[in-house]
Interface confidence: low
Amino acid sequence: MRWCLLLIWAQGLRQAPLASGMMTGTIETTGNISAEKGGSIILQCHLSSTTAQVTQVNWEQQDQLLAICNADLGWHISPSFKDRVAPGPGLGLTLQSLTVNDTGEYFCIYHTYPDGTYTGRIFLEVLESSVAEHGARFQIPLLGAMAATLVVICTAVIVVVALTRKKKALRIHSVEGDLRRKSAGQEEWSPSAPSPPGSCVQAEAAPAGLCGEQRGEDCAELHDYFNVLSYRSLGNCSFFTETG
């Protein structure tokens, strides 16, 4: 049995306003982010400061439903987005093959009991490649400058490593890869444990999900439950802190 923990924010948490008042929970999102045309981006929200039971998370773009992660039934990706949207990591959503038309507001809507509905907002701007290379305009300027500086330093280090051909090359390449991701305007994640594609887990130390083993295919229940073309083999999601 594989277990996985919620991927947690390494940086850049923003707090989104709640959908309605008097609820204790808060939705944490990346706020405004940007990505390069043709690339991919992770949209992620995290509900905290509440003991409410999450039963479903909806991802929407303006008035269009992109995806649903249901507590018992797993992931559903809207047919019109199935070729460009992938579930995860966690309760998040990965947008692929980005186009300029993907620019806009994205909403994560957490359905909970007994609190009700929480909504988080993310603004994504998809930049033309030439623009994106000069940094993401929506990132905090200081972080952007730091990232750019690190890229320059990192490039120099790589040149030195390539020339000297020392054994530490692999480790430096790994660091360089991380820095490239930062400079492209994507959020950095710090996984506490591996989170296989298609799984979604909210609670720390929560089990893999109500659909069982983490797989890149439907669990038996999903396959049995959804005899519908719009449901793909996307794995499953779990929201529960209780374990037997």
Epitope: M1, I68, Y113, A206, G209, C219, D224, V228, E242
Partner: antibody
Framework: QVQLVQSGAEVKKPGASVKVSCKAS????????VHWVRQAPGQGLEWMGT????????SYNQKFKGRVTLTADTSTSTVYMELSSLRSEDTAVYYC????????WGQGTTVTVSS | EIVLTQSPGTLSLSPGERATLSCRAS???????LHWYQQKPGASPKLLIY???NLASGIPDRFSGSGSGTSYTLTISRLEPEDFAVYYC??????????FGAGTKLELK
Amino acid sequence: QVQLVQSGAEVKKPGASVKVSCKASGYTFTSYNVHWVRQAPGQGLEWMGTIYPGNLATSYNQKFKGRVTLTADTSTSTVYMELSSLRSEDTAVYYCARSGTMDYWGQGTTVTVSS
Amino acid sequence: EIVLTQSPGTLSLSPGERATLSCRASSSISSTYLHWYQQKPGASPKLLIYNTQNLASGIPDRFSGSGSGTSYTLTISRLEPEDFAVYYCQQFGGYPLITFGAGTKLELK
């Protein structure tokens, strides 16, 4: 064929606990959720909670939170529903059902709470 | 909480007639998560229709389902004597995770 066989009727006093079993057969036990639903005399259906035997993940109806506990024994393909602090209004027939669609149901277990 | 309201509470019809049972949700739900069950006295509920319109295994095709958003309907095109029972709609995925309607009793006129 798929079957869910529940334990027999129970008579309990207020304040006591009851543990109802649901033995599954005819399918892969660890691949489907098992839900619990109850029905008071002459009333409708009320969902209590669900457990996924594959990893023991559970979810409960907030109304029963703290009073109901769902467990599963994969070695015997059996799910258990324990309801504590019983009161007279818990008198009902308790059903287990397979999967989100509840495509197969147990025969029901009558629990009577009376002093 | 998503509340499902079924109407009418009781429907009195004769064999051969058409029965139309309604289920309204207090807020919009996905049609994927709306199911119908039949229950006869002293018996366990039985799945009739899943995902709004899909016929469960072994259910005769005189039963059909439709609807979207907040309004859903179960139709029995031509009533047979064995169809007289209580019918429940159920939603999945709201909060609580599962809720049932109060039921419609289909009785012999």
